[in-house]
Structure formats: C-alpha cells, structure tokens
Amino acid sequence: QRFAQAQQQLPLESLGWDVAELQLNHTGPQQDPRLYWQGGPALGRSFLHGPELDKGQLRIHRDGIYMVHIQVTLAICSSTTASRHHPTTLAVGICSPASRSISLLRLSFHQGCTIASQRLTPLARGDTLCTNLTGTLLPSRNTDETFFGVQWVRP
Amino acid sequence: QRFAQAQQQLPLESLGWDVAELQLNHTGPQQDPRLYWQGGPALGRSFLHGPELDKGQLRIHRDGIYMVHIQVTLAICSSTTASRHHPTTLAVGICSPASRSISLLRLSFHQGCTIASQRLTPLARGDTLCTNLTGTLLPSRNTDETFFGVQWVRP
Amino acid sequence: QRFAQAQQQLPLESLGWDVAELQLNHTGPQQDPRLYWQGGPALGRSFLHGPELDKGQLRIHRDGIYMVHIQVTLAICSSTTASRHHPTTLAVGICSPASRSISLLRLSFHQGCTIASQRLTPLARGDTLCTNLTGTLLPSRNTDETFFGVQWVRP
C-alpha cells in the first residue's frame, strides 16, 4: 500500500519515464538535410514527456540509456524512383553539443520507399538529436508513415 | 527492504507492465484485409499479460503510452512477386471504438518481402488494434517471420 | 521520499533493468554463419548491463520478457548485389542450451542492403542468443549500421 501511494505521489518524471514521439513538421532548405519535427496532443498522437524540441530538433533532458526509433517514408515513391534517386540515406545522430557529435543510426532506401529501425544508446542531458535525410526525395508527412521517438529505458 | 517487499507483493499488473506478443492465426476471407492473431504459452513463445484477444484482434486493458511493433513476411515472395503485386500494404490502427478509429503505422512492401516497424502511441482501455494487409499476397505463419506486439511504457 | 530513497539504495540490477547493445566484432570462418559481437564503453556506445558475452554471443542473466532488436547492413551492397546474392538471410535465435534452441526472428535481404526488426520474447537465465547471417555477403562493421541489443521488459 505504502509503495503504491508513494508511486502515485511521485511525479512520473522522477521515475525517469521520459518519452517522446514526434511527427514531421517540415524539411529544411536545399542545403539543410535535417528533418524538422513537432509534437503535442493538439497535433494528434505525438507528445513530449521530458524531452523538448529546439527549433524542430529533439533535446534530451535526462541522462540515461534510451531506445531511439524512427520510420521515414518517401512521399512520391516507387521502387524505380528510389533506385533512380539512390543514394537516399537517413541518419540519426547527436548533432549538439559538437563535442558529442556522432551518428547513431543510418539506413539507405535502395529500392524501398520506407526505412524503419531502432536502437539502444546512451544519451545525456542537453544532447540534441538530428535526423538527416540526404538526397533529393522528400519525406511523407503522414503521421502513420513518418515518425521519430525516444524512450528512456534506464540510468 | 520495504520497497523490495512491496514490489514483490503488488501484482505486476498494478505496476502497469501490460505486454503482449502474438503470432498469426489466420487471414480472413478475400474481402476482409484483417490479420487474425493468437497468443498463449501453449502456442509457443506468444503471450498476453494484460491485453486480450477479441476475435483475433488485440484489445487494450490499460490506458497509457505503448510501444507497438510488428513484422510481417509474405509467404510466397521474391522481389519480383512483391513488385508485381504492388501495392501490398500493412497498416496497424485502432479499429474500435469507431470514434477513435485511426491508422497508427503504415508500410508498403514495394520490392521487399518483409516489413518491420515500431512506434510509441497513446492507447486507452477498450481500444482494439487491427492489422490490415491489403493486396492478394498472403503472410507467412512462421512464428519467427510474422508477429505483432505491444508493450506498456508509461501512463 | 522513502520510496525514492529505497529506489536509489537498491542496485539497478535488482529492479531487473538488464540491457545490452552490441556492435559487430567479426564474422566467423566460412562454415560458421554466426556474427560475433562486442560491447563496452571503451568501444564507443555499446554496453552490457546484466547480460554477458560468451565467445562473442550474448548470454542472458535474468529470466523475463525481453525486447530483442537488431539491424544489419551489408558491407558492399547495392540492390543488384543483394538480389544477385539472394538468399541472404539473418536469423536471431536461442542457440544454447540445445534443449531451448529456436529461431526467434528471421529476415531476408531480397533487394535491400539493410534489415532491421525487433520483437518481444521470453528468455531465461543462461539462454545464449546467436545471430546467423547466411549467404556470401559480409556485414558492415560501422556502429551506426550494424548493432544488436536486448532490453529486459518484465518478469
């Protein structure tokens, strides 16, 4: 009983349950390969509980090991489009602070129009994650086709 | 010590650890795109702890944010089969109650024979998830090739 | 307050937060389809908290339901390479003890150069997971392209 009460009284954030699921807001100008994300209940099924958005990029607020996952679908795409525009590549990485810059997850589209993957990685408070889509093809903004999220797993 | 004892005394369900991993039972008749799932230790490595099956569809018993994941492999498939039968598409969504009907996750096979993805999404008690495979190709029933699951992550 | 203190005093391992994320060390000789993994902070962003490596294979230390995930990218690959060398298949399974040997997750590359998937599965203390890559193509050792991990989810 005491544990159950304590669990209810403590804010969820103190249990380390940071989590976010984002939907695509927009792509950058020609020279900027980054995808810009948005989240919040007003937008549908996206949300941020702990992490924050900084100019469309996801900033971590709690140290720990996170499960990072992403799916990106190309907007106007067939297997011939994908192969003709190859290489189209999606990379998720820490883009700031610069001292911690690293690529965490990378996939190419080849003859497919969707990539989806996930991985566990240590992240620190202040790490900003960027998702770079290189190539000329544009991502779909459909919320069931393109999304990006993180889930705190353990300290 | 007190916390450890309390944790052991509380049923797991009260900690919100709802989780399910399902294997394919069967496909519907021609006009029904839904996949019908089954789970339980007698069937192998599938299980339901919290969620339930309602006529082969997964029904949620606890409000919260869930990680939903799926992999579907086509039974008789090569890259030429997949492209010739295009579009073959897999969509996971809330199909009931009708007021909450929405597509959560969508992927096309293009020239591939397997799709796999995952996402975080809020689900409510009573939500039923349906997995629709549109097209003429049939999914593999091998338990290491086709599976569908959810994991409660936080309130 | 009492719960928060207790939580801090208990070792994380007692909460069942076993987790590992591995990077590719090397492939085996011609007749051995297994991938050999490595992990640890000295190697970059890979780690083992609970599970252990036994000759490059991942051994589980705690009973429970785990989320198993993997991504493998082929090293020198285009869609034509992948289709010409078909079938190239990745399977994750329990390889020891022999009495529990089973394939958990299987994907073919077809015309793609990367596979990525995840699933929930019960694992027991002492289970060793093997990842078999069949075919003649070699995997990339880039840490953002090829990785394998597990996360304890619940008892």
């Epitope: - | 294997q23 021609q30 029904d32 069937l43 192998g44 049939l138 | -």
Partner: nanobody, 116 residues
C-alpha cells in the same frame, strides 16, 4: 494424428498436364492452410502454392498462371492442377496440412518428371 498421401505424379512430356491429389486420413476442416511444396534434386524445398481456409490462394512466380490449387473439405482432399509443364517442374511434390495451433502434417511425396 492425420496422415497425408499424395498421388497423381508420373512422367509427362513438356507442355502436358497432371493433377496431383493429397488425401487426408482425417478431416481437413481444421486446416488453416494447405500447401504444395516441391524439391528438385540438389535444391531446397520450395513452397509452390497455398490455399487458406477462407479460399484465398497464392502461387510461386515460377508456376503462376500454370498451376491451380484447390481443396475439397468434403472429400478431405487437396489438389494441384499442373498445366503446360516444363522440365524445370521436375521434382518430388509434397503436400502440407497446417493446423491453427501450428501442428503441421506432411505427405511422403510424389515424383513428377517432365521429359521428352
């Protein structure tokens, strides 16, 4: 314990036809799927055709448009009608009965040889 027995194989000239049958010793009504496989010498067993309990069918690229799978629950029999046969169709053909609970039953096979 269901037992399956294939029949209908034999020697046929290229362009010819054969109809394979697979008869079950018990009811096939509980089969979620019934399938025909084939195995040519020195090759892996290949899934050729599927019919589901709902009547849906799928075929391998190599036989699509030439082979037709069907099932007759009343006769506890699965069929494979093979038309316009080619030398590369030469193989041992096996039927498989797959129950909802993942219990599978296999036949012992029937040889099909396509040669002039």
């Amino acid at each position: 314990q269901v037992q399956l027995q294939e029949s209908g194989g034999g020697l046929v000239q290229p362009g010819g036809s054969l109809r394979l049958s697979c008869t079950a010793s018990g009811s096939i009504f509980s089969a979620t799927r019934m399938e025909w496989y084939r195995q040519a010498p020195g090759k892996q067993r290949e899934l050729v055709a599927i019919v589901t309990s709902g009547g849906r069918t799928n075929y391998a690229d190599s036989v699509n448009g030439r082979f037709t799978i069907s099932r007759d629950n009343a006769k506890n029999t699965l069929y494979l009608q093979m038309n316009n046969l080619k030398p590369e169709d030469t193989a041992v053909y096996y039927c498989k009965f797959e129950r909802y609970d993942y219990v599978n039953y296999w036949g012992r096979g029937t040889q099909v040889t396509v040669s002039s």
